[in-house]
């Protein structure tokens, strides 16, 4: 039994880091493998992660962490029974994938303005709370070409757009994702999408 693709890990910078790897053949990850991880710190304890299958030869493990600090460094040991298959390290702050925003809501009752709001996925005491920026994707269910991205570079988890920038009388969907420049993170997954019917009053023409 050998590791074909070494584990790569990403952290949500709060409580979970996810590591994925591939074995050289079909493997029952949960029964055959264990991933041990330990914060490099005096008296810190080693923890064991039981991996799940992720395709035939792929494994994924969700490492639980009480908290994350920028200088944290973890040792990782992948075991098959008594055999050490791979040894490495992981610095969560260098491999951050933020949590996806939640509670995306479209408010359509504000005088021909669409107000989109969502929730920051981090608590206020987390470093990323004040460092997230967002991308909002809006698309038409009827017209695949009607697809747009709005970059929200301010901290407020909201976006205002004129309803008239979208077509009237049809349904749209929106979703939002996050990233943090400070840690050069990857983008989060998209939030669940929300749907609304776009309608607004056409302005009367003056003659």
């Amino acid at each position: 039994m050998k590791v074909l693709q070494e584990p790569t890990c990403v952290s949500d910078y709060m409580s979970i880091s996810t590591c994925e790897w591939k074995m050289n053949g079909p493997t029952n990850c949960s029964t055959e493998l264990r991933l041990l991880y330990q914060l490099v710190f005096l008296l810190s304890e080693a923890h064991t992660c039981i991996p799940e299958n992720n395709g035939g030869a792929g494994c994924v493990c969700h490492l639980l962490m009480d908290d994350v600090v920028s200088a944290d460094n973890y040792t990782l040991d992948l075991w098959a029974g008594q055999q050490l298959l791979w040894k490495g390290s992981f610095k969560p702050s260098e491999h951050v994938k933020p949590r996806a925003p939640g509670n995306l809501t479209v408010h359509t009752n504000v005088s021909d303005t669409l107000l989109l709001t969502w929730s920051n996925p981090y608590p206020p005491d987390n470093y990323l709370y004040n460092h997230l920026t967002y991308a909002v994707n809006i698309w038409s269910e009827n017209d695949p070409a009607d697809f747009r991205i709005y970059n929200v570079t301010y901290l407020e988890p909201s976006l205002r757009i004129a309803a008239s920038t979208l077509k009237s009388g049809i349904s749209y969907r929106a979703r939002v994702r996050a990233w943090a420049q400070c840690y050069n993170t990857t983008w989060s997954e998209w939030s669940p999408s929300t749907k609304w019917h776009n309608s607004y009053r056409e302005p009367f023409e003056q003659h």
């Epitope: 710190f41 005096l42 008296l43 810190s44 304890e45 600090v69 200088a71 944290d72 460094n73 390290s89």
Partner: antibody, heavy 120, light 110 residues
């Protein structure tokens, strides 16, 4: 209110041992590491060792080469530091201080200090 | 082992003026996953008091004239407006598998 109360001053002869106690109150004793730090007159702070009261795991400053032993009595919420083969340069104020892994070892409460004098 | 060198050894500052204390580590600390920096204040005859943890986090109850910054090998404790009660010796501390203290900086009033 969090309190760490240490035992009283000690005068010892070279070659003897000293055992200093640190009684904790006002928090859950097993939730925090307990550290021992000493300070010789006019000198910098010097870490001696740390114990995790939850499982009695210990880590020591190798400078003391087995002369220091840190223990806990969980039922009494008390930590102990014993230093053996005392020499005159061990004359110092000895402090206990608690720390939290979440804060990565920052010592937020300290005992009042115990003066140990080693003199023939 | 990491060695922490504080500068200056002593510092005389007028009341209301800024005091800046430096702490240099012999190896990169926070940017390399190599540990954590904290700052303490110690007054004569008293145990140390935690001021700043994890480089730049103010401990509860500590006045906000104290702040910490830095990365890599260089860290700084700043007192933005020195008060009489700030006269003390200040220590930086590095922690990972060992705990190390700097040599201390004595702050006095000019």
């Amino acid at each position: 209110e969090v309190q760490l109360v240490q035992s009283g001053a000690e005068v010892k002869k070279p070659g003897a041992s000293v055992k200093v106690s640190c009684k904790a109150s006002g928090y859950t004793f097993t939730d925090y590491y307990m550290n021992w730090v000493r300070q010789a007159p006019g000198q910098r702070l010097e870490w001696m060792g740390t114990i995790n009261p939850y499982n009695a795991g210990t880590g020591y400053n190798q400078k003391f080469k087995g002369r220091v032993t840190i223990t806990v009595d969980k039922s009494a919420s008390t930590a102990y530091m014993e230093l053996s083969s005392l020499r005159s340069e061990d004359t110092a104020v000895y402090y206990c201080a608690r720390s939290l892994l979440r804060r990565r070892g920052a010592m937020d409460y300290w005992g009042q200090g115990t003066t140990v004098t080693v003199s023939s | 082992d990491i060695v922490l060198t504080q500068s200056p050894d002593s510092l005389a500052v007028s009341l209301g003026e800024r005091a800046t204390i430096n702490c240099r580590a012999s190896k990169s600390v926070s940017t390399s996953g190599y540990g954590y920096i904290h700052w303490y204040q110690q007054k004569p005859g008293q145990p140390p008091k935690l001021l700043i943890y994890l480089v730049d986090n103010l401990e509860s109850g500590v006045p906000d004239r104290f702040s910490g910054s830095g990365s890599g090998t260089d860290f700084t404790l700043t007192i933005s407006s020195l008060q009489a009660e700030d006269v003390a010796t200040y220590y930086c501390q590095h922690i990972r598998e060992l705990y190390t203290f700097g040599g201390g900086t004595k702050v006095e009033i000019k």
